[in-house]
Interface confidence: medium
Protein backbone atom coordinates (compact mmCIF):
# COMPACT_ATOMS: atom_id res chain seq x y z
CA UNK A 1 0.00 0.00 0.00
CA UNK A 2 1.07 3.55 -0.59
CA UNK A 3 0.22 6.94 -2.04
CA UNK A 4 0.84 8.53 -5.42
CA UNK A 5 1.37 12.26 -4.95
CA UNK A 6 1.03 14.96 -7.57
CA UNK A 7 2.13 18.55 -7.04
CA UNK A 8 0.97 21.12 -9.59
CA UNK A 9 3.55 23.90 -9.90
CA UNK A 10 1.96 26.10 -12.55
CA UNK A 11 -0.77 26.20 -15.14
CA UNK A 12 -0.92 28.97 -17.68
CA UNK A 13 -0.53 30.02 -21.28
CA UNK A 14 2.24 28.16 -23.05
CA UNK A 15 5.02 29.86 -24.99
CA UNK A 16 4.36 31.17 -28.45
CA UNK A 17 1.85 33.45 -30.14
CA UNK A 18 -1.88 32.95 -29.86
CA UNK A 19 -1.70 31.82 -26.26
CA UNK A 20 -4.69 32.86 -24.14
CA UNK A 21 -4.16 35.53 -21.55
CA UNK A 22 -6.22 33.95 -18.84
CA UNK A 23 -8.99 31.40 -18.43
CA UNK A 24 -10.96 33.91 -16.37
CA UNK A 25 -12.21 37.39 -17.16
CA UNK A 26 -13.23 40.53 -15.34
CA UNK A 27 -16.87 39.76 -16.09
CA UNK A 28 -16.63 36.10 -15.11
CA UNK A 29 -14.30 35.42 -12.19
CA UNK A 30 -13.32 31.78 -11.91
CA UNK A 31 -11.20 29.32 -10.03
CA UNK A 32 -9.16 26.33 -11.15
CA UNK A 33 -8.81 22.80 -9.87
CA UNK A 34 -7.29 19.58 -11.09
CA UNK A 35 -8.22 15.95 -11.42
CA UNK A 36 -5.78 13.07 -11.83
CA UNK A 37 -6.59 9.58 -13.08
CA UNK A 38 -4.11 6.72 -12.80
CA UNK A 39 -4.06 3.42 -14.69
CA UNK A 40 -1.54 0.61 -14.30
CA UNK A 41 0.94 -0.30 -17.04
CA UNK A 42 2.05 1.36 -20.23
CA UNK A 43 -0.45 -0.43 -22.42
CA UNK A 44 -2.56 1.35 -25.00
CA UNK A 45 -5.64 1.57 -22.84
CA UNK A 46 -8.92 2.93 -24.07
CA UNK A 47 -9.61 6.42 -22.78
CA UNK A 48 -12.83 5.31 -21.20
CA UNK A 49 -11.25 2.51 -19.18
CA UNK A 50 -11.55 3.11 -15.44
CA UNK A 51 -8.91 4.82 -13.33
CA UNK A 52 -7.93 1.39 -12.00
CA UNK A 53 -5.12 2.72 -9.80
CA UNK A 54 -7.34 5.50 -8.49
CA UNK A 55 -8.31 9.11 -9.08
CA UNK A 56 -8.21 12.29 -7.05
CA UNK A 57 -9.61 15.77 -7.26
CA UNK A 58 -7.84 18.81 -5.86
CA UNK A 59 -9.44 21.47 -3.76
CA UNK A 60 -10.71 24.42 -5.74
CA UNK A 61 -8.19 27.24 -6.06
CA UNK A 62 -8.65 30.85 -5.02
CA UNK A 63 -11.08 32.96 -7.02
CA UNK A 64 -9.27 34.82 -9.78
CA UNK A 65 -10.53 37.90 -11.58
CA UNK A 66 -8.55 39.23 -14.51
CA UNK A 67 -7.71 42.91 -14.21
CA UNK A 68 -7.99 44.58 -17.63
CA UNK A 69 -4.72 46.13 -18.71
CA UNK A 70 -2.70 44.53 -15.93
CA UNK A 71 0.03 42.02 -16.80
CA UNK A 72 -1.17 38.43 -16.57
CA UNK A 73 0.08 37.00 -13.26
CA UNK A 74 0.55 33.31 -12.52
CA UNK A 75 -2.87 31.76 -12.06
CA UNK A 76 -3.64 31.00 -8.41
CA UNK A 77 -3.59 27.26 -7.81
CA UNK A 78 -5.24 25.06 -5.19
CA UNK A 79 -3.23 24.37 -2.06
CA UNK A 80 -1.78 20.99 -1.31
CA UNK A 81 -1.00 17.77 -3.12
CA UNK A 82 -3.31 15.54 -5.07
CA UNK A 83 -3.02 12.18 -3.37
CA UNK A 84 -4.14 8.89 -4.88
CA UNK A 85 -3.88 6.04 -2.38
CA UNK A 86 -3.20 2.57 -3.80
CA UNK A 87 -3.97 -0.58 -1.82
CA UNK A 88 -1.95 -3.16 -3.70
CA UNK A 89 1.55 -3.19 -5.15
CA UNK A 90 2.75 -0.11 -7.01
CA UNK A 91 3.00 -1.30 -10.63
CA UNK A 92 6.16 0.62 -11.51
CA UNK A 93 4.78 1.58 -14.91
CA UNK A 94 1.61 3.64 -15.11
CA UNK A 95 -0.45 5.94 -17.29
CA UNK A 96 -1.81 9.23 -16.04
CA UNK A 97 -4.42 11.75 -17.10
CA UNK A 98 -4.37 15.22 -15.54
CA UNK A 99 -7.30 17.51 -16.19
CA UNK A 100 -7.47 21.23 -15.48
CA UNK A 101 -10.99 22.42 -14.73
CA UNK A 102 -12.45 25.88 -14.51
CA UNK A 103 -15.43 26.83 -12.38
CA UNK A 104 -17.07 30.09 -13.40
CA UNK A 105 -18.69 31.98 -10.58
CA UNK A 106 -20.23 34.92 -12.39
CA UNK A 107 -22.96 33.00 -14.20
CA UNK A 108 -25.25 31.72 -11.48
CA UNK A 109 -28.24 30.71 -13.61
CA UNK A 110 -28.66 27.04 -12.91
CA UNK A 111 -25.67 26.86 -10.61
CA UNK A 112 -21.97 27.25 -11.31
CA UNK A 113 -20.66 26.54 -14.78
CA UNK A 114 -17.81 24.09 -15.32
CA UNK A 115 -15.56 23.60 -18.28
CA UNK A 116 -12.56 21.42 -18.95
CA UNK A 117 -9.68 23.68 -19.93
CA UNK A 118 -6.99 21.13 -20.64
CA UNK A 119 -6.27 17.45 -20.44
CA UNK A 120 -2.78 15.97 -20.59
CA UNK A 121 -1.83 12.31 -20.57
CA UNK A 122 1.34 10.29 -20.44
CA UNK A 123 2.94 6.98 -19.60
CA UNK A 124 5.82 6.76 -17.16
CA UNK A 125 8.09 4.40 -15.25
CA UNK A 126 8.35 5.25 -11.58
CA UNK A 127 9.75 3.35 -8.61
CA UNK A 128 8.05 3.86 -5.28
CA UNK A 129 10.24 5.54 -2.71
CA UNK A 130 12.16 7.47 -5.36
CA UNK A 131 12.56 11.23 -5.57
CA UNK A 132 10.07 13.66 -7.08
CA UNK A 133 9.99 13.49 -10.87
CA UNK A 134 9.34 16.75 -12.72
CA UNK A 135 7.33 17.05 -15.89
CA UNK A 136 6.01 19.66 -18.32
CA UNK A 137 3.05 18.88 -20.54
CA UNK A 138 1.29 21.03 -23.13
CA UNK A 139 -2.35 20.82 -24.08
CA UNK A 140 -3.25 23.13 -26.92
CA UNK A 141 -2.23 26.63 -25.87
CA UNK A 142 -1.88 25.72 -22.18
CA UNK A 143 1.17 24.50 -20.31
CA UNK A 144 1.11 22.44 -17.10
CA UNK A 145 4.19 21.99 -14.88
CA UNK A 146 4.04 19.37 -12.17
CA UNK A 147 5.99 16.86 -10.08
CA UNK A 148 4.97 13.42 -8.92
CA UNK A 149 6.20 10.54 -6.83
CA UNK A 150 4.96 7.28 -5.31
CA UNK A 151 5.70 6.54 -1.68
CA UNK A 152 4.95 3.53 0.46
CA UNK A 153 2.85 3.73 3.59
CA UNK A 154 4.39 1.97 6.60
CA UNK A 155 4.85 -0.90 7.10
CA UNK A 156 5.30 -1.34 3.31
CA UNK A 157 8.73 -0.75 1.78
CA UNK A 158 10.47 -1.35 -1.55
CA UNK A 159 10.05 -0.04 -5.07
CA UNK A 160 6.65 -1.77 -5.34
CA UNK A 161 5.61 -1.33 -1.67
CA UNK A 162 5.26 -5.09 -1.37
CA UNK A 163 7.77 -5.86 1.40
CA UNK A 164 6.66 -5.36 4.97
CA UNK A 165 8.90 -4.05 7.74
CA UNK A 166 7.16 -3.51 11.03
CA UNK A 167 8.71 -3.01 14.48
CA UNK A 168 8.07 -5.87 16.89
CA UNK A 169 6.67 -5.21 20.31
CA UNK A 170 9.52 -7.24 21.81
CA UNK A 171 12.86 -5.48 22.15
CA UNK A 172 14.74 -5.64 18.88
CA UNK A 173 17.87 -7.78 18.60
CA UNK A 174 18.96 -5.75 15.61
CA UNK A 175 21.93 -3.44 16.02
CA UNK A 176 21.68 0.36 16.05
CA UNK A 177 20.36 1.81 12.81
CA UNK A 178 18.83 -1.50 11.75
CA UNK A 179 15.15 -2.39 11.91
CA UNK A 180 13.44 -5.76 12.30
CA UNK A 181 11.70 -6.90 9.14
CA UNK A 182 8.68 -9.19 8.76
CA UNK A 183 8.12 -12.00 8.03
CA UNK A 184 11.50 -13.23 9.32
CA UNK A 185 11.88 -11.99 12.88
CA UNK A 186 15.61 -12.63 12.91
CA UNK A 187 16.20 -10.74 9.66
CA UNK A 188 17.37 -7.19 10.15
CA UNK A 189 17.11 -4.61 7.42
CA UNK A 190 19.35 -1.59 7.10
CA UNK A 191 17.76 1.68 6.09
CA UNK A 192 18.15 1.93 2.33
CA UNK A 193 21.25 3.99 1.54
CA UNK A 194 22.09 4.34 -2.14
CA UNK A 195 25.62 4.58 -3.52
CA UNK A 196 27.30 7.79 -2.41
CA UNK A 197 26.69 10.52 -4.95
CA UNK A 198 23.76 8.77 -6.63
CA UNK A 199 21.63 11.48 -8.23
CA UNK A 200 18.60 12.15 -6.02
CA UNK A 201 16.63 13.31 -9.07
CA UNK A 202 17.52 10.63 -11.61
CA UNK A 203 18.65 7.64 -9.58
CA UNK A 204 17.18 5.28 -7.03
CA UNK A 205 18.15 2.00 -5.35
CA UNK A 206 16.48 -1.21 -4.29
CA UNK A 207 19.58 -2.58 -2.56
CA UNK A 208 21.95 -0.63 -0.32
CA UNK A 209 24.91 0.81 -2.20
CA UNK A 210 23.44 0.57 -5.68
CA UNK A 211 22.42 3.36 -8.02
CA UNK A 212 19.79 2.54 -10.64
CA UNK A 213 18.83 5.15 -13.20
CA UNK A 214 15.43 6.41 -14.19
CA UNK A 215 14.63 6.35 -17.90
CA UNK A 216 16.67 8.89 -19.85
CA UNK A 217 19.69 8.85 -17.50
CA UNK A 218 22.81 6.76 -17.29
CA UNK A 219 26.22 6.60 -15.65
CA UNK A 220 27.34 5.13 -12.34
CA UNK A 221 25.59 7.94 -10.49
CA UNK A 222 22.78 8.54 -13.04
CA UNK A 223 24.06 12.01 -13.83
CA UNK A 224 24.55 11.58 -17.59
CA UNK A 225 21.61 12.13 -19.96
CA UNK A 226 21.39 9.25 -22.41
CA UNK A 227 21.83 11.54 -25.40
CA UNK A 228 25.26 12.88 -24.37
CA UNK A 229 28.58 11.22 -23.79
CA UNK A 230 32.24 12.14 -23.54
CA UNK A 231 33.05 9.36 -26.00
CA UNK A 232 34.16 10.21 -29.51
CA UNK A 233 31.87 7.52 -30.81
CA UNK A 234 28.68 7.81 -28.84
CA UNK A 235 27.31 4.59 -30.32
CA UNK A 236 30.55 2.63 -29.84
CA UNK A 237 30.94 -0.29 -27.46
CA UNK A 238 31.98 0.20 -23.88
CA UNK A 239 35.76 0.36 -23.58
CA UNK A 240 37.51 -0.74 -20.43
CA UNK A 241 40.78 0.86 -21.60
CA UNK A 242 39.37 4.33 -22.19
CA UNK A 243 36.89 4.11 -19.34
CA UNK A 244 34.41 5.52 -21.80
CA UNK A 245 30.86 5.48 -20.51
CA UNK A 246 28.51 4.57 -23.30
CA UNK A 247 24.87 5.59 -22.98
CA UNK A 248 22.09 3.53 -24.46
CA UNK A 249 20.74 3.96 -27.97
CA UNK A 250 20.22 7.51 -29.16
CA UNK A 251 16.81 9.07 -28.50
CA UNK A 252 16.07 9.27 -32.23
CA UNK A 253 16.92 5.62 -32.89
CA UNK A 254 13.91 3.93 -34.43
CA UNK A 255 12.34 7.39 -34.97
CA UNK A 256 9.95 7.91 -32.04
CA UNK A 257 8.01 10.51 -34.06
CA UNK A 258 4.72 9.16 -35.33
CA UNK A 259 2.66 10.14 -38.37
CA UNK A 260 5.64 11.14 -40.52
CA UNK A 261 7.26 13.45 -37.99
CA UNK A 262 11.01 13.99 -38.19
CA UNK A 263 13.24 13.51 -35.13
CA UNK A 264 16.17 15.66 -34.03
CA UNK A 265 18.28 15.15 -30.93
CA UNK A 266 18.45 17.83 -28.26
CA UNK A 267 20.97 18.04 -25.40
CA UNK A 268 18.53 16.35 -23.02
CA UNK A 269 16.19 14.31 -25.19
CA UNK A 270 14.71 14.67 -28.68
CA UNK A 271 12.32 16.89 -30.57
CA UNK A 272 9.77 15.97 -33.22
CA UNK A 273 8.88 18.26 -36.10
CA UNK A 274 5.31 17.28 -36.91
CA UNK A 275 3.52 17.38 -40.24
CA UNK A 276 0.42 19.53 -40.55
CA UNK A 277 -2.56 18.17 -38.66
CA UNK A 278 -0.54 16.48 -35.90
CA UNK A 279 1.03 17.66 -32.67
CA UNK A 280 2.29 16.34 -29.35
CA UNK A 281 5.70 15.25 -28.11
CA UNK A 282 5.80 12.43 -30.68
CA UNK A 283 3.33 13.88 -33.25
CA UNK A 284 0.96 11.28 -31.88
CA UNK A 285 -2.07 13.55 -31.50
CA UNK A 286 -4.34 14.14 -34.47
CA UNK A 287 -5.38 17.71 -35.11
CA UNK A 288 -9.07 16.81 -34.96
CA UNK A 289 -10.47 17.83 -31.59
CA UNK A 290 -13.88 18.07 -29.97
CA UNK A 291 -14.05 21.68 -31.16
CA UNK A 292 -14.44 20.29 -34.68
CA UNK A 293 -17.62 18.46 -33.67
CA UNK A 294 -16.57 14.98 -34.82
CA UNK A 295 -19.30 13.06 -33.00
CA UNK A 296 -22.52 12.42 -34.93
CA UNK A 297 -26.03 11.50 -33.80
CA UNK A 298 -25.80 13.32 -30.48
CA UNK A 299 -22.57 11.61 -29.36
CA UNK A 300 -20.74 13.21 -26.43
CA UNK A 301 -17.20 14.24 -27.33
CA UNK A 302 -14.52 13.74 -24.69
CA UNK A 303 -10.86 14.59 -25.21
CA UNK A 304 -8.84 11.42 -25.54
CA UNK A 305 -6.75 10.33 -22.58
CA UNK A 306 -4.69 8.23 -24.98
CA UNK A 307 -2.05 10.05 -27.04
CA UNK A 308 -3.23 8.15 -30.09
CA UNK A 309 -6.70 9.65 -29.86
CA UNK A 310 -7.34 13.37 -29.56
CA UNK A 311 -11.01 12.74 -28.84
CA UNK A 312 -13.37 9.94 -27.95
CA UNK A 313 -17.03 9.88 -28.94
CA UNK A 314 -19.42 8.42 -26.37
CA UNK A 315 -22.40 7.38 -28.39
CA UNK A 316 -26.04 7.56 -27.33
CA UNK A 317 -27.98 4.31 -27.29
CA UNK A 318 -28.53 3.01 -30.80
CA UNK A 319 -25.28 4.29 -32.33
CA UNK A 320 -21.73 3.04 -32.50
CA UNK A 321 -18.45 3.63 -34.34
CA UNK A 322 -15.58 5.95 -33.53
CA UNK A 323 -17.74 8.92 -34.54
CA UNK A 324 -21.15 7.45 -33.61
CA UNK A 325 -21.78 7.27 -37.34
CA UNK A 326 -23.18 3.73 -37.40
CA UNK A 327 -26.66 2.83 -36.29
CA UNK A 328 -26.63 -0.26 -34.07
CA UNK A 329 -28.86 -3.06 -35.36
CA UNK A 330 -30.34 -3.69 -31.96
CA UNK A 331 -32.69 -6.30 -33.39
CA UNK A 332 -29.70 -8.50 -34.20
CA UNK A 333 -29.54 -9.30 -30.48
CA UNK A 334 -33.01 -10.92 -30.87
CA UNK A 335 -34.53 -9.17 -27.85
CA UNK A 336 -38.07 -10.30 -28.64
CA UNK A 337 -38.88 -13.66 -27.15
CA UNK A 338 -41.30 -16.37 -28.22
CA UNK A 339 -41.01 -15.53 -31.89
CA UNK A 340 -41.96 -11.87 -31.55
CA UNK A 341 -41.12 -9.49 -34.40
CA UNK A 342 -38.49 -6.86 -33.52
CA UNK A 343 -38.92 -3.25 -34.69
CA UNK A 344 -36.10 -0.72 -34.18
CA UNK A 345 -37.79 2.67 -34.09
CA UNK A 346 -34.53 4.56 -33.53
CA UNK A 347 -35.50 6.06 -30.19
CA UNK A 348 -36.78 2.74 -28.87
CA UNK A 349 -37.23 -0.94 -29.57
CA UNK A 350 -40.68 -2.45 -30.02
CA UNK A 351 -41.68 -6.10 -30.12
CA UNK A 352 -44.75 -7.21 -32.06
CA UNK A 353 -45.84 -10.35 -30.25
CA UNK A 354 -47.36 -13.51 -31.69
CA UNK A 355 -50.86 -14.42 -30.56
CA UNK A 356 -50.82 -15.73 -27.02
CA UNK A 357 -47.81 -13.65 -25.87
CA UNK A 358 -47.52 -10.16 -24.40
CA UNK A 359 -45.09 -7.82 -22.62
CA UNK A 360 -42.40 -5.39 -23.82
CA UNK A 361 -40.28 -8.34 -24.98
CA UNK A 362 -43.18 -10.83 -25.51
CA UNK A 363 -42.00 -12.55 -22.37
CA UNK A 364 -45.45 -13.24 -20.91
CA UNK A 365 -47.22 -16.41 -22.05
CA UNK A 366 -50.94 -15.76 -21.98
CA UNK A 367 -53.49 -18.46 -21.03
CA UNK A 368 -54.40 -19.50 -24.56
CA UNK A 369 -57.42 -21.51 -23.50
CA UNK A 370 -59.01 -18.76 -21.40
CA UNK A 371 -62.50 -18.13 -22.75
CA UNK A 372 -62.02 -20.72 -25.52
CA UNK A 373 -64.32 -23.73 -25.93
CA UNK A 374 -63.90 -26.81 -28.07
CA UNK A 375 -67.16 -28.23 -29.49
CA UNK A 376 -68.36 -31.82 -29.64
CA UNK A 377 -66.41 -33.02 -26.59
CA UNK A 378 -63.00 -31.69 -27.73
CA UNK A 379 -60.43 -30.54 -25.16
CA UNK A 380 -58.40 -27.31 -25.32
CA UNK A 381 -54.60 -27.66 -25.43
CA UNK A 382 -52.49 -24.59 -24.61
CA UNK A 383 -49.18 -23.90 -26.32
CA UNK A 384 -47.33 -22.16 -29.09
CA UNK A 385 -49.07 -18.87 -28.43
CA UNK A 386 -52.45 -20.07 -29.67
CA UNK A 387 -55.05 -22.48 -28.38
CA UNK A 388 -55.57 -25.81 -30.14
CA UNK A 389 -58.42 -28.25 -29.81
CA UNK A 390 -57.86 -31.95 -29.49
CA UNK A 391 -61.07 -33.23 -31.06
CA UNK A 392 -63.13 -36.32 -30.35
CA UNK A 393 -63.26 -39.00 -33.03
CA UNK A 394 -65.26 -37.96 -36.02
CA UNK A 395 -64.73 -34.24 -35.52
CA UNK A 396 -62.07 -31.80 -36.66
CA UNK A 397 -61.33 -28.17 -37.41
CA UNK A 398 -59.99 -25.42 -35.15
CA UNK A 399 -62.90 -25.70 -32.68
CA UNK A 400 -64.00 -29.33 -33.46
CA UNK A 401 -67.14 -28.02 -35.16
CA UNK A 402 -66.53 -29.81 -38.46
CA UNK A 403 -67.49 -33.45 -39.07
CA UNK A 404 -64.32 -35.26 -39.93
CA UNK A 405 -63.93 -37.93 -42.59
CA UNK A 406 -61.13 -40.07 -41.17
CA UNK A 407 -60.46 -41.50 -44.61
CA UNK A 408 -60.00 -38.11 -46.28
CA UNK A 409 -56.27 -38.11 -45.67
CA UNK A 410 -55.86 -41.55 -47.34
CA UNK A 411 -54.23 -43.10 -44.29
CA UNK A 412 -54.01 -46.67 -45.65
CA UNK A 413 -50.68 -47.40 -47.32
CA UNK A 414 -49.83 -49.62 -50.30
CA UNK A 415 -53.28 -49.45 -51.89
CA UNK A 416 -55.20 -50.43 -48.80
CA UNK A 417 -58.87 -49.42 -48.72
CA UNK A 418 -60.18 -47.17 -45.93
CA UNK A 419 -63.52 -47.62 -44.15
CA UNK A 420 -64.94 -45.08 -41.68
CA UNK A 421 -66.04 -46.67 -38.43
CA UNK A 422 -67.60 -45.23 -35.26
CA UNK A 423 -64.37 -45.86 -33.37
CA UNK A 424 -62.14 -44.38 -36.04
CA UNK A 425 -61.02 -45.95 -39.30
CA UNK A 426 -60.24 -49.44 -40.55
CA UNK A 427 -57.82 -50.33 -43.36
CA UNK A 428 -58.43 -53.35 -45.63
CA UNK A 429 -54.91 -54.13 -46.89
CA UNK A 430 -53.95 -55.29 -50.36
CA UNK A 431 -52.54 -58.81 -50.64
CA UNK A 432 -49.05 -59.10 -49.14
CA UNK A 433 -49.44 -56.13 -46.69
CA UNK A 434 -50.48 -55.92 -43.08
CA UNK A 435 -50.64 -53.52 -40.11
CA UNK A 436 -53.16 -50.96 -38.88
CA UNK A 437 -52.26 -48.72 -41.82
CA UNK A 438 -51.02 -51.49 -44.16
CA UNK A 439 -47.54 -50.20 -43.51
CA UNK A 440 -45.83 -53.61 -43.32
Amino acid sequence: AGVFELQIHSFGPGPGPGAPRSPCSARLPCRLFFRVCLKPGLSEEAAESPCALGAALSARGPVYTEQPGAPAPDLPLPDGLLQVPFRDAWPGTFSFIIETWREELGDQIGGPAWSLLARVAGRRRLAAGGPWARDIQRAGAWELRFSYRARCEPPAVGTACTRLCRPRSAPSRCGPGLRPCAPLEDECEAPLVCRAGCSPEHGFCEQPGECRCLEGWTGPLCTVPVSTSSCLSPRGPSSATTGCLVPGPGPCDGNPCANGGSCSETPRSFECTCPRGFYGLRCEVSGVTCADGPCFNGGLCVGGADPDSAYICHCPPGFQGSNCEKRVDRCSLQPCRNGGLCLDLGHALRCRCRAGFAGPRCEHDLDDCAGRACANGGTCVEGGGAHRCSCALGFGGRDCRERADPCAARPCAHGGRCYAHFSGLVCACAPGYMGARCEF
Epitope: E48, G111, W114, S115, V302
Partner: nanobody, 129 residues
Protein backbone atom coordinates in the same frame (compact mmCIF):
# COMPACT_ATOMS: atom_id res chain seq x y z
CA UNK B 1 -22.71 0.72 -22.19
CA UNK B 2 -23.29 2.46 -18.87
CA UNK B 3 -26.29 1.24 -16.89
CA UNK B 4 -27.65 3.02 -13.84
CA UNK B 5 -30.08 1.34 -11.45
CA UNK B 6 -31.80 3.37 -8.74
CA UNK B 7 -33.32 2.00 -5.55
CA UNK B 8 -34.53 3.21 -2.17
CA UNK B 9 -37.58 5.20 -3.17
CA UNK B 10 -40.88 4.91 -1.37
CA UNK B 11 -43.51 6.72 0.65
CA UNK B 12 -42.71 8.64 3.81
CA UNK B 13 -44.31 11.21 6.08
CA UNK B 14 -43.15 14.82 6.02
CA UNK B 15 -40.06 15.23 8.18
CA UNK B 16 -38.95 11.67 7.50
CA UNK B 17 -35.87 10.36 5.73
CA UNK B 18 -35.01 8.18 2.75
CA UNK B 19 -31.74 7.02 1.24
CA UNK B 20 -31.56 6.53 -2.51
CA UNK B 21 -28.87 4.39 -4.13
CA UNK B 22 -27.64 4.36 -7.70
CA UNK B 23 -25.49 1.45 -8.83
CA UNK B 24 -23.48 2.05 -12.00
CA UNK B 25 -22.17 -0.70 -14.24
CA UNK B 26 -20.07 -0.27 -17.36
CA UNK B 27 -19.04 3.03 -15.81
CA UNK B 28 -16.60 4.90 -18.04
CA UNK B 29 -13.96 7.50 -17.42
CA UNK B 30 -15.92 10.05 -19.44
CA UNK B 31 -18.67 9.98 -16.83
CA UNK B 32 -16.85 12.41 -14.58
CA UNK B 33 -20.03 13.41 -12.79
CA UNK B 34 -22.89 11.53 -11.21
CA UNK B 35 -25.98 13.34 -10.13
CA UNK B 36 -29.53 13.08 -8.89
CA UNK B 37 -32.35 14.81 -10.73
CA UNK B 38 -36.07 14.82 -10.06
CA UNK B 39 -39.22 15.41 -12.01
CA UNK B 40 -42.60 16.09 -10.48
CA UNK B 41 -45.76 15.58 -12.58
CA UNK B 42 -46.21 18.43 -15.03
CA UNK B 43 -42.85 20.00 -14.19
CA UNK B 44 -39.44 20.05 -15.84
CA UNK B 45 -36.67 17.78 -14.67
CA UNK B 46 -34.44 19.65 -12.20
CA UNK B 47 -31.05 19.05 -10.66
CA UNK B 48 -30.93 18.00 -7.01
CA UNK B 49 -27.29 17.16 -6.28
CA UNK B 50 -24.11 16.29 -8.18
CA UNK B 51 -20.82 14.70 -7.17
CA UNK B 52 -17.53 14.56 -9.09
CA UNK B 53 -16.10 11.06 -9.31
CA UNK B 54 -12.63 10.69 -7.85
CA UNK B 55 -13.13 13.60 -5.49
CA UNK B 56 -15.54 15.00 -2.97
CA UNK B 57 -16.71 18.08 -4.87
CA UNK B 58 -20.49 18.35 -4.56
CA UNK B 59 -23.22 20.71 -5.74
CA UNK B 60 -26.74 21.10 -4.40
CA UNK B 61 -29.87 22.86 -5.56
CA UNK B 62 -30.87 25.68 -3.21
CA UNK B 63 -34.12 23.91 -2.38
CA UNK B 64 -32.35 20.88 -0.86
CA UNK B 65 -29.11 22.32 0.52
CA UNK B 66 -28.67 21.37 4.17
CA UNK B 67 -31.29 18.61 3.98
CA UNK B 68 -29.89 16.30 1.28
CA UNK B 69 -26.39 14.81 1.12
CA UNK B 70 -24.84 13.15 -1.93
CA UNK B 71 -21.99 10.69 -1.45
CA UNK B 72 -20.11 8.08 -3.42
CA UNK B 73 -18.65 4.64 -2.77
CA UNK B 74 -16.01 4.27 -5.48
CA UNK B 75 -15.32 0.63 -4.63
CA UNK B 76 -18.96 -0.27 -5.28
CA UNK B 77 -19.42 2.29 -8.07
CA UNK B 78 -22.49 3.51 -6.23
CA UNK B 79 -23.82 6.99 -5.52
CA UNK B 80 -26.17 7.72 -2.63
CA UNK B 81 -28.61 10.52 -1.86
CA UNK B 82 -29.46 10.82 1.82
CA UNK B 83 -32.69 12.83 2.09
CA UNK B 84 -33.62 14.19 5.53
CA UNK B 85 -36.41 16.52 6.68
CA UNK B 86 -38.44 15.61 3.61
CA UNK B 87 -41.23 17.94 2.52
CA UNK B 88 -44.32 17.25 0.38
CA UNK B 89 -42.76 19.37 -2.39
CA UNK B 90 -39.93 16.80 -2.60
CA UNK B 91 -42.43 14.34 -4.07
CA UNK B 92 -41.18 13.37 -7.53
CA UNK B 93 -39.58 10.67 -9.63
CA UNK B 94 -35.86 10.73 -8.79
CA UNK B 95 -33.38 9.88 -11.54
CA UNK B 96 -29.71 9.03 -11.32
CA UNK B 97 -27.54 10.37 -14.15
CA UNK B 98 -23.91 10.15 -15.25
CA UNK B 99 -22.02 12.25 -17.74
CA UNK B 100 -19.37 14.82 -18.22
CA UNK B 101 -18.79 18.20 -19.74
CA UNK B 102 -17.46 18.62 -23.26
CA UNK B 103 -13.73 19.10 -23.70
CA UNK B 104 -13.87 21.98 -26.14
CA UNK B 105 -14.24 24.60 -23.42
CA UNK B 106 -18.01 24.83 -23.77
CA UNK B 107 -19.86 25.68 -20.61
CA UNK B 108 -21.54 22.90 -18.70
CA UNK B 109 -23.74 23.12 -15.65
CA UNK B 110 -23.51 20.31 -13.09
CA UNK B 111 -27.12 20.87 -11.99
CA UNK B 112 -28.74 20.86 -15.43
CA UNK B 113 -29.72 17.76 -17.43
CA UNK B 114 -27.81 18.52 -20.67
CA UNK B 115 -24.42 16.84 -20.61
CA UNK B 116 -25.66 13.86 -18.64
CA UNK B 117 -25.75 11.23 -21.35
CA UNK B 118 -26.65 8.23 -19.18
CA UNK B 119 -29.87 8.01 -17.16
CA UNK B 120 -31.51 5.46 -14.89
CA UNK B 121 -35.17 4.45 -15.01
CA UNK B 122 -36.04 6.43 -11.88
CA UNK B 123 -37.40 5.67 -8.41
CA UNK B 124 -40.55 7.27 -7.01
CA UNK B 125 -40.41 9.31 -3.79
CA UNK B 126 -43.73 10.33 -2.23
CA UNK B 127 -43.87 12.60 0.82
CA UNK B 128 -47.26 13.00 2.45
CA UNK B 129 -48.21 15.66 4.96
Amino acid sequence: EVQLVESGGGSVQAGGSLRLSCAASGYTYSSNFMGWFRQAPGKEREGVATIVSGGGTTYYADSVRGRFTISQDNAKNTVYLQMNSLKPEDTAMYYCAAGGPPTNGAKWYPLRPPGYNYWGQGTQVTVSS
